[in-house]
C-alpha cells in the first residue's frame, strides 16, 4: 500500500513510513504551486483588486471543528460566501484550517519579503457552479477555489474572537475527533474591515496533496494578532497520531518557486 502524505516533522518523529513534502505525488511536482514568498515591492498594484464583500460571515453559528490528522478544520458548509476582491464570481465557504509551528518565526506557509509568521489561517471557498465565463475555464478552471490567507503574529492581548476555536482544541487532540465550538462568527476571526483592503493575489495550488493548481490566492498584508498562549495552544493540544506521541506542529509546506507567475496587489 502506498504511504500516506505527511509533513517533515511527522517523518522525523514517528515510526510510520509516510511521504514527506518533496515526495508528494499528484500535481505537487508541477510548476504553479503554493505557498510562495511574496516580494512586496515587486507586486504591481492592480486597480481591479477592490474590497471584498462577505456574506454570512457575521452570523453567529455553532461550527463543527475537527482534527483531520494534518490540521484543525472548521466545517463551513456553504454557510458563508465572498465576492468582490477582483474575483470572477461569488465563492462559497467550505472550510477553514490553520498552519503553525511551536516557534514564532516559522509557522506560516506564505512569507512576506522572506519573513514567516507564527501561523497562517486559510478560508477555503469554491466558485459557485455555473459561473465560469467560458467552456475552457469550466473544464479546466485555474480559479475554481479561492483561498483567503491570513498571516498570524503574536500580540500582547488575548484575541477574544479566537477563543471559541482555541477552547475547542482540548476536545479534539487526536485525528478524526470532532467537536462543536461555542457560538461564534467567521467575522470574529478576521482583522477589522479596514485592514482587509490591502492584499496580494496570485494563481497557485492547494498546499496539501493533491496540490491541484486551481486556486486563486488572496494573502492579506495585515496580520491577525493572537496572544502567545493562544498560538501555543495549537501545538500543545493537538496531535498528529492517535497515540498522542507526535505534537501537531510545523504543518507547513516548504516555499515553492514563483516561476513565470506574477503577484499583484490591491
Amino acid at each position: 500500500a502506498e504511504s500516506h502524505w505527511c509533513y517533515e516533522v511527522q517523518a522525523e518523529s514517528s515510526n510510520y513510513p509516510c511521504l514527506v513534502p518533496v515526495k508528494w505525488g499528484g500535481n505537487c511536482q508541477k510548476d504553479r504551486q503554493s505557498p510562495i514568498n511574496i516580494v512586496t515591492t515587486k507586486a504591481k498594484v492592480d486597480k481591479k483588486l477592490g474590497r471584498f464583500f462577505f456574506s454570512g460571515y457575521d452570523k453567529k453559528q455553532t461550527w463543527t471543528v475537527q482534527n483531520n490528522g494534518h490540521s484543525v478544520m472548521m466545517l463551513l458548509e456553504n454557510k458563508a460566501s465572498i465576492s468582490g476582491g477582483g474575483l470572477p464570481a461569488p465563492y462559497q465557504a467550505k472550510q477553514l484550517h490553520l498552519h503553525w509551528s511551536d516557534l514564532p518565526y516559522k509557522g506560516s506557509e506564505h512569507s512576506l519579503d522572506g519573513e514567516h509568521f507564527a501561523m497562517e489561517m486559510h478560508i477555503v471557498h469554491e466558485k459557485e457552479k455555473g459561473t465560469s465565463r467560458n467552456v475552457k475555464e469550466a473544464q479546466d478552471p485555474e480559479d475554481e477555489i479561492a483561498v483567503l490567507a491570513f498571516l498570524v503574529e503574536a500580540g500582547t492581548q488575548v484575541n477574544e474572537g479566537f477563543q471559541p476555536l482555541v477552547e475547542a482544541l482540548s476536545n479534539i487532540p487526536k485525528p478524526e475527533m470532532s467537536t462543536t465550538m461555542a457560538e461564534s462568527s467567521l467575522l470574529d476571526l478576521l482583522p477589522k474591515e479596514e485592514k482587509l483592503r490591502h492584499y496580494f493575489r496570485y494563481l497557485g495550488s492547494l498546499t496539501t496533496p493533491t496540490c491541484d493548481e486551481k486556486v486563486v490566492w488572496t494573502v492579506f498584508r495585515e496580520p491577525i494578532q493572537l496572544h502567545r498562549e493562544q498560538i501555543l495552544a495549537f501545538s500543545q493540544k493537538l496531535y498528529y497520531d492517535k497515540e498522542q506521541t507526535v505534537s501537531m506542529k510545523d504543518n507547513v509546506r516548504p516555499l515553492q518557486q514563483l516561476g513565470q507567475r506574477t503577484v499583484i496587489k490591491s
Partner: antibody, heavy 119, light 107 residues
C-alpha cells in the same frame, strides 16, 4: 519572582565542547520561550537562538547553527546551551533570557555565564 | 536582516540633565523596538517595550517614543545610578538584532 540563574564561569581548552545551564523559577517554564544571547568583552549583544521548553522546538541565528545546541528539561525547569568546537572567538558572556511576548523582547535575564577559551 | 544604528556612541551628561538616545532601523519596524540598560558587569534590564510602553518597576524618568525607523529613549533627569550602556533591540524580523549601544557617562 521570576528568576533565571545561570551556571558558573568556565575555562575550557580550544577544540572542546561545553554545556551551560539556565534554571528558571517563578513562572510556568513551558509557557515562555528561552533565548540565548552572546556578548563579547566590550561588545554589543548578539542573538544566538531560542527554544520552546514545552516542545523542545528550536530556532537558531544562521551564524550559530553549527556552534550552539539548545535543549530544555521540563522536569527541572532548566534550559541548556551546548557550544562545540570552541575557539577564542567563543570567549564571551552568554545570557539566557525569557521572551516576554512570543517572538519579542526579553523581559527577564540571567546573570550571565562567562566562558573563557584558552590553552 | 534588519540593521540597528545607535547614536551617539558615548553621551556625557551632568546629574539632573535630560538626555536622549537615538536608535535607527534600516527599514520600517512599526513600534517593535525595545530598550535595555546594562550596568557594568551586569545583565541587560528591560526599560521600555514597543517603543513607548513602560515597564513595571522602572522609574518614570525613563520614556520612549518613535515609530517606523526612528526611535528615542529619554531620561528626563539623569541620576548617577543611570550610568550604563543602553541598547535598543528590534523584534520585527527574525533574527532579532540589537544596536551597538550608547554609553552614558557623567561629566
Amino acid at each position: 519572582d521570576v528568576q533565571l540563574v545561570e551556571s558558573g564561569a568556565e575555562l575550557v581548552r580550544p577544540g572542546t565542547s561545553m554545556k551551560m545551564s539556565c534554571k528558571a523559577s517563578g513562572y510556568a517554564f513551558t509557557n515562555y520561550l528561552i533565548e540565548w544571547i552572546k556578548q563579547r568583552p566590550g561588545q554589543g549583544l548578539e542573538w544566538i537562538g531560542v527554544i520552546n521548553p514545552g516542545s523542545g522546538g528550536t530556532h537558531y541565528n544562521e551564524k550559530f547553527k553549527d556552534k550552539a545546541t539548545l535543549t530544555a528539561d521540563k522536569s527541572s525547569s532548566t534550559a541548556y546551551m551546548q557550544l562545540s568546537s570552541l575557539t577564542s572567538d567563543d570567549s564571551a558572556v552568554y545570557f539566557c533570557a525569557r521572551e516576554g511576548d512570543y517572538g519579542s523582547r526579553a523581559d527577564y535575564w540571567g546573570q550571565g555565564t562567562t566562558l573563557t577559551v584558552s590553552s | 536582516q534588519i540593521q540597528i544604528t545607535q547614536s551617539p556612541a558615548i553621551l556625557s551628561v551632568s546629574p539632573g540633565e535630560r538626555v536622549s538616545f537615538s536608535c535607527r532601523a534600516s527599514q520600517s519596524i512599526g513600534t517593535r523596538i525595545h530598550w535595555y540598560q546594562q550596568r557594568t558587569n551586569g545583565s541587560p534590564r528591560l526599560l521600555i517595550k514597543y517603543a513607548s510602553e513602560s515597564i513595571s518597576g522602572i522609574p518614570s524618568r525613563f520614556s520612549g517614543s518613535g515609530s517606523g525607523t526612528d526611535f528615542t529613549l529619554s531620561i528626563n533627569s539623569v541620576e548617577s545610578e543611570d550610568i550604563a550602556v543602553y541598547y535598543c533591540q528590534q523584534s520585527n524580523s527574525w533574527p532579532t538584532t540589537f544596536g551597538a549601544g550608547t554609553k552614558l557617562e557623567l561629566k
